[in-house]
């Protein structure tokens, strides 16, 4: 906190500009008006202060705003967002995209932080709803963000948003998130050949029905073990012993590591013996 | 993660010139600040210049304007400050400091610094 101290003759700011960065921070605490900041936030981002100086300010606008900023501060905020808790974003009202968008692009490329989960979880606190307009900005600044959702959140998921998602994106998604997403995916890569297909869908493949999975063993897909642990047992369950081989190709190897693991051991367990045994693996019933 | 690493500092008569250099471990984005500060036995820290590397903006200090120039060259991620005319008054510890939208584990924002190198002025 900085002391309270009266400003030096003749050093009252009349407007935000590249000088400031030369005051010490008493200087700032006591020479910058508050409102005038708030009014001239855009331009605090195009001046090079230093993070003891964004404090200062931040301290100014907080004092000036004690119950949360208005949204036209919020807007332009900039990296002065970096310096905010999840406390203070609480107190914000953001109902704009603008605003959201602004606030994300400052901490592109770096992991979701507190500060933005809470700044996301406000705006879609104040808009009611996950509208596609929304998803469509999370998803792009954050494909992960999906499986953070709840299944019922992610029903209003656009197959359009599906694009921008990368097989990590889903490492977090549980099995009814990919119930949800599976179909999207589907309906979002129709249009792609086989083998760009699979590629694309491949990391959705936990949510994907009996009757896909026969589908692709028809299409010389190769699909690694990896994949094929994670897919719904009781999907999995009714293959055969020939469309897993299909489906596995050369994969279908890696079998007897995983014998004694869902969903390979209760796969094994529903297949006839002598089926088993034309895969030359060893595998029990 | 960012490493600054000052070097030029030494002793110099008043009105001859000393270059300083602060070499950046890595790589100084588009969105970084570079500043040089300076610091006076017994005094407190003060901003000497600044460059915003995107718009490549310079800004300097009254007191060291038309005799101290700070430039930066992105190929060797180096800053650099130029200092001439050089006074009594302009012996400190001089730092270089990186802004940039980098950030902790939580979020919040990290700056860099180097040690300093001193500069002393002296006849």
């Known amino acids: 906190e900085v002391e309270k101290t009266a400003c030096p003759s003749g050093k009252k700011a009349r407007e935000i500009d590249e000088s400031l960065i030369f005051y010490k921070k008493w200087e700032l605490e006591a020479c910058v008006d508050a409102a005038l900041l708030a009014t001239q936030m855009d331009r605090v981002n195009a001046i090079p202060f230093t993070y003891e100086q964004l404090d200062v300010l931040k301290h100014k606008l907080d004092e000036l705003y004690p119950q949360g900023y208005p949204e036209s501060v919020i807007q332009h905020l900039g990296y002065l967002f970096l310096k905010m808790s999840p406390e203070d974003i609480r107190k914000w009202n953001v109902t704009s995209l603008e605003t959201l968008k602004a606030l994300l692009e400052v901490n592109k490329g770096h992991e979701m932080s507190p500060q933005v989960a809470t700044l996301i979880d406000r705006f879609v606190k104040g808009r009611g709803q996950l509208d596609k307009d929304t998803l469509d900005t999370l998803t792009a600044f954050y494909p992960g963000y999906l499986c953070s959702l709840s299944p019922e959140e992610l029903s209003s998921v656009p197959p359009s948003s599906i694009w921008a998602v990368r097989p990590q994106d889903l490492d977090t998604c549980d099995p009814r998130q990919l119930d949800v997403l599976y179909p999207k995916a589907r309906l979002a890569f129709q249009n792609m050949n086989g083998s760009e297909y699979f590629v694309k869908i491949q990391s959705f493949l936990g949510g994907a029905p009996t009757e896909d999975l026969k589908a692709l063993s028809q299409q010389n897909v190769s699909m690694d073990l990896a994949t094929f642990m994670k897919l719904r047992t009781d999907a999995v369950l009714p293959l055969t012993v020939a469309e897993v081989q299909k489906l596995l190709g050369p994969h279908v190897e890696g079998l007897k590591a995983e014998e004694r693991h869902r969903p390979v051991r209760d796969w094994i367990l529903r297949q006839r013996q002598d089926d088993l045994d034309t895969l030359g693996l060893g595998l029990q019933g | 993660q960012v490493q600054l690493v000052e070097s030029g500092g030494g002793v110099v008569q008043p009105g001859r010139s000393l270059r300083l250099s602060c070499a950046a471990s890595g790589t100084i984005s588009d969105t970084s600040r570079m500043h040089w500060f300076r610091q006076a036995p017994g005094k407190e820290r003060e901003l000497v210049a600044a460059i915003s590397v995107g718009t490549t903006t310079y800004y300097y200090a009254d007191s060291v304007k038309g005799r101290f120039t700070i430039s930066l060259d992105n190929s060797k991620n180096t800053l650099y400050l130029q200092m001439n005319s050089l006074r009594a008054e302009d012996t400190a510890v001089y730092y270089c400091?990186?802004?940039?939208?980098?950030?902790?584990?939580?979020?919040?924002?990290?700056?860099?610094w180097g040690q300093g190198t001193l500069v002393t002025v002296s006849s």
């Open positions: 400091a990186a802004y940039g939208v980098d950030v902790d584990v939580n979020g919040y924002l990290l700056d860099y």
